[in-house]
């Protein structure tokens, strides 16, 4: 366990031209806070994805206000650091979000408003117990200042917060096999209480007896290189030997999430959805206010001014979760039919429409047969996304409106000659043919074969098709 | 990461069918949220938007218009890669041909992953 | 002939700041999402700006896009050399059912 801790040194103008103008005015006057996002590994992940090492608000900075025609200078800062408190180990390597936000002080409805003035984002390798690193990033025309560093809580110590210190319990020296713990001389090293066996570099424990592992190791001693091949059955073979990853208990096993939180898993770890009034990892950041500014991406809050009574952020479109911390993606939910695409607009979902339908969700389908008529005694057939209409003998094309050619298909059959006729056609058939289309032969005998002639028809007699 | 990787010729003759196939990785061409393109580049025309297939229920294709009768975009599920067929091709259809992914949910049109582009000549 | 225009070349000494507009109707970037592609030197187009404002993970922030009416801009504040590109918009065109792209700009870096 231990503590990321963040000192703003100047946010202001960066080098160089196009000095921004400044955030402030005397009709506005305003206050700047602060935002820290931090997560483990070289991620480099979306702004909107879960803090997972943790995050943090700053207090607010002095009321500024612009002097007239003077230059923006470096802005006033709020007092004090940021501090991420971490439980597990320190990861070493991790990335940051460090958003400057502004506090509009004028005549808002319903409140101050915040709006984001500048985020910036970086990946780093840090040791904890180290010394302050510095840093400078810039922001469009912005330029911020500030220095950081990981520090273990008592009575953990180590680059990574997993080896446990004790006071002395000799004054002189330290127990056996005990090394004094730099940099606090007057502490030993805490007799191992971890698993035996269990990896110093890759394992690390919070209780008696466990063996917990950094990311990237595997195994009952964290001994084991996590594979990134597939494992051969289901589970996987013995993890101890190839590193494949066993399904062990799931992050949300035992609830992680405080106060009321729900907990649900992640590809990498687990999200708590906090309810009001509570925030952080694990929803362990309580007592907040509007006046901590706890709604994110311009999230509007409105609610209590002390600590007992819950605020709620109003989110802007696009944004969800008690702080807005989460960004939607409304349109997973596929809401567009028959084809149409889904855009969000950020205001506003909207469905693009294939040629053929129409409607909020591409829902009606233009070509449908509703209210379309299929001219001439025709009938109307649905089907793909498209009507058709299927005609009455002697007529033909999309509406049924164009008068067909009947013997434009040769429909007589053995040399029959065809002949067009007012309620369709007639085949006068050659000679040893007969039927409808002269498809049946005559036979030698005079006897037909199937089926048998009309009465008063002799076979030769054209035959009109109905 | 998705990664898209274009094979097929580099030089056909005028009047013959140009083939090309992308492979996908990483991504799967039946992706409920991506649509899958064809694109070309040339000095004379700039980037012009040759089609996409995508799948929502069932695989859709679009077409430019001008290029309508003679091109075809199709899916092939089970190799995970997308192809193009052109035909009746002419001088004026060389051009570097990229197959790309829009990817953004919400955001179809933001062509996020390109393919590192084939050189397409048609000359006799 | 492409739908939507673009000026053909645009400059800046480093730090400056350089604003390159896009020009087109009703039926691309008044009713659709415009975005914004970075072409480098020798190498396939890069998405830049997407849904008119929005910057893909791993785009610096000194890249900003907006759009009124049937016109889009993107800026970029303090250019640096390696800004030097080509840079295109594209939109749906929902009487051509299709993508149209800009003609393109040379951004150079004085």
């Known amino acids: 366990a231990g503590v990321f801790e963040l000192q703003i040194h100047s946010f202001g103008p960066g080098p160089g031209p196009g000095a921004p103008r400044s955030p402030c005015s005397a009709r506005l006057p305003c206050r700047l806070f602060f935002r820290v996002c931090l997560k483990p590994g070289l991620s480099e992940e979306a702004a909107e994805s879960p803090c997972a090492l943790g995050a943090a608000l700053s207090a607010r900075g002095p009321v500024y206000t612009e002097q007239p025609g003077a230059p923006a200078p470096d802005l006033p800062l709020p007092d004090g650091l940021l501090q991420v408190p971490f439980r597990d180990a320190w990861p070493g390597t991790f990335s940051f979000i460090i958003e400057t936000w502004r506090e509009e002080l004028g005549d808002q409805i319903g409140g101050p408003a915040w709006s984001l003035l500048a985020r910036v984002a970086g990946r780093r390798r840090l040791a904890a117990g180290g010394p302050w690193a510095r840093d400078i990033q810039r922001a469009g025309a912005w330029e911020l200042r500030f220095s950081y560093r990981a520090r273990c809580e008592p009575p953990a110590v180590g680059t990574a917060c997993t080896r446990l210190c004790r006071p002395r319990s000799a004054p002189s020296r330290c127990g056996p096999g005990l090394r004094p713990c730099a940099p606090l001389e007057d502490e030993c090293e805490a007799p191992l209480v971890c698993r035996a066996g269990c990896s110093p570099e890759h394992g690390f424990c919070e209780q008696p007896g466990e063996c917990r592992c950094l990311e990237g190791w595997t195994g009952p001693l964290c001994t084991v290189p996590v594979s990134t091949s597939s494992c051969l059955s289901p589970r996987g073979p013995s993890s101890a030997t190839t590193g494949c990853l066993v399904p062990g208990p799931g992050p949300c096993d035992g609830n992680p999430c405080a106060n009321g939180g729900s907990c649900s898993e992640t590809p990498r770890s687990f999200e708590c959805t906090c309810p009001r009034g509570f925030y952080g990892l694990r929803c362990e950041v309580s007592g907040v206010t509007c006046a901590d500014g706890p709604c994110f991406n311009g999230g509007l809050c409105v609610g209590g001014a002390d600590p007992d009574s819950a605020y709620i952020c109003h989110c802007p479109p696009g944004f969800q979760g008690s702080n807005c911390e989460k960004r939607v993606d409304r349109c997973s939910l596929q809401p567009c039919r028959n084809g149409g695409l889904c855009l969000d607009l950020g205001h506003a979902l909207r469905c693009r429409c294939r040629a053929g339908f129409a409607g909020p969700r591409c829902e009606h389908d233009l070509d449908d047969c509703a209210g379309r008529a299929c001219a001439n005694g025709g009938t109307c057939v649905e089907g793909g996304g498209a009507h058709r209409c299927s005609c009455a003998l002697g007529f033909g094309g999309r509406d049924c409106r164009e008068r067909a050619d009947p013997c434009a298909a040769r429909p007589c059959a053995h040399g029959g000659r065809c002949y067009a006729h007012f309620s369709g056609l007639v085949c006068a058939c050659a000679p040893g043919y007969m039927g409808a289309r002269c498809e049946f032969p005559v036979h030698p005998d005079g006897a037909s074969a199937l089926p048998a002639a009309p009465p008063g028809l002799r076979p030769g007699d054209p035959q009109r098709y109905l | 990461q998705v990664q898209l990787q274009q094979s097929g010729p580099g030089l056909v003759k005028p009047s013959q069918t140009l083939s090309l196939t992308c492979a996908i990785s990483g991504d799967s061409v039946s992706s409920n949220s991506a649509v899958w393109n064809w694109i070309r580049q040339s000095p004379s025309r700039g980037l012009e938007w040759l089609g996409w297939t995508y799948y929502r229920s069932k695989y859709y294709n679009d077409y430019a218009v001008s290029l309508k009768s003679r091109i075809t975009i199709n899916p092939d599920t089970s190799k995970n890669q997308f192809s193009l067929q052109l035909n009746s091709l002419t001088p004026e259809d060389t051009a570097v041909y990229y197959c790309?992914?829009?990817?953004?949910?919400?955001?179809?049109?933001?062509?996020?992953?390109w393919g590192q582009g084939t050189m397409v000549t048609v000359s006799s | 002939q492409s739908a939507l225009t673009q000026p053909p070349s645009a400059s800046g000494t480093p730090g400056q700041r350089v604003t390159i507009s896009c020009s087109g109707s009703?039926?691309?970037?008044?009713?659709?999402?415009i975005n914004w592609y970075q072409q480098l030197p020798g190498t396939a187009p890069k998405l830049l700006i997407y849904s008119n404002n929005q910057r893909p993970s791993g785009v610096p922030d000194r890249f900003s896009g907006s759009k009124s009416g049937t016109s889009a801009s993107l800026a970029i504040s303090g250019l640096q050399s390696e800004d030097e590109a080509d840079y295109y918009c594209?939109?749906?065109?929902?009487?051509?059912?299709?993508?149209?792209f800009g003609t393109g700009t040379k951004v150079t870096v004085l």
């Open positions: 790309t992914r829009g990817g953004i949910v919400g955001a179809p049109d933001g062509f996020d992953i």
């Open positions: 594209a939109a749906w065109d929902d009487s051509l059912n299709g993508h149209v």
């Open positions: 009703n039926s691309n970037i008044g009713s659709n999402p």
